[in-house]
Interface confidence: low
């Protein structure tokens, strides 16, 4: 399942972030 952590990140099987930004490792913004 998917859960929202305290920092507002949507955590799934691979901790993929829904609020991607400059600091989000799981985003595409390198």
């Amino acid at each position: 399942g998917w859960t929202l952590n305290s920092a507002g990140y949507l955590l799934g099987p691979h901790a993929v972030g829904n609020h991607r930004s400059f600091s989000d490792k799981n985003g595409l913004t390198s």
Partner: antibody
């Protein structure tokens, strides 16, 4: 609870180097990029660069290439920023950042003879 | 590098007034994935910056609805509908679409 605890203020001599630490808790550092941001006194914010602690891959703003080195120790969940050949231009507060929500309290580095 | 230009540098307001801050980027900050990673932060004196808005117009959790973000391409705006004392500080825009990531120069919101 997510915490980023940065090292104490540093007073360093011109030409020296300094290594700042950012001890994290409440999350696994491997799961996030760790960034460093510079703020000179009464000035704005500058992005220095970031590291992927899982593989030590780092990228930098070209302005900080050769000046800054970002490393991480996954065993202690700590990120580091090393600054070399310090000058008065390096006098600033340095923040570590995890996710765009979580910032450390900042470390003041003062470069003075 | 993407230059982020904020105006005004200083914004004197009366409590209860509306405030508007502009941020222009020197090139499009639409990412190749189609999203625009434009954020707004507030830094109060002696504190670390705090996120207000992400991806142009999304309020972060806990941010009052008097804050709103808008814009597209290269032109972005942060509006505060009714300024309260706790809103005073320096506001920064930030682009997280293109490396190196860059901040605007800041806008100081102060009491008139």
């Amino acid at each position: 609870e997510i915490q980023l605890q940065q090292s104490e203020a540093e007073l360093v001599r011109p030409g020296a180097l300094v290594k700042l630490s950012c001890k994290t808790s409440g999350f696994n550092i491997k799961d996030y990029y760790m960034h460093w941001v510079k703020q000179r006194p009464e000035q704005g914010l500058e992005w220095i660069g970031r590291i992927d602690p899982e593989n030590d891959n780092s990228i930098y703003d070209p302005n900080f290439q050769g000046k800054a080195s970002i490393t991480a120790d996954t065993s202690s969940n700590t990120a580091y920023l090393q600054l070399s050949s310090l000058t008065s231009e390096d006098t600033a507060v340095y923040y570590c950042v995890r996710g765009y929500v979580d910032w450390g309290q900042g470390t003041l580095v003062t470069v003075s003879a | 590098d993407v230059l982020m230009t904020q105006t005004p540098l200083s914004l004197p307001v009366s409590l209860g007034d509306q405030a508007s801050i502009s941020c222009r980027s020197s090139q499009s900050i639409v990412h190749s994935d189609g999203d625009t990673y434009l954020e707004w932060y507030l830094q109060k004196p002696g504190q670390s910056p705090k996120l207000l808005i992400f991806k142009v117009s999304n309020r972060f959790s806990g941010v009052p609805d008097r804050f709103s973000g808008s814009g597209s391409g290269t032109d972005f705006t942060l509006k505060i509908s009714r300024v309260e004392a706790e809103d005073l500080g320096v506001y920064y825009c930030f682009q997280g679409s293109h490396v190196p990531y860059t901040f605007g120069g800041g806008t100081k919101l102060e009491i008139k």
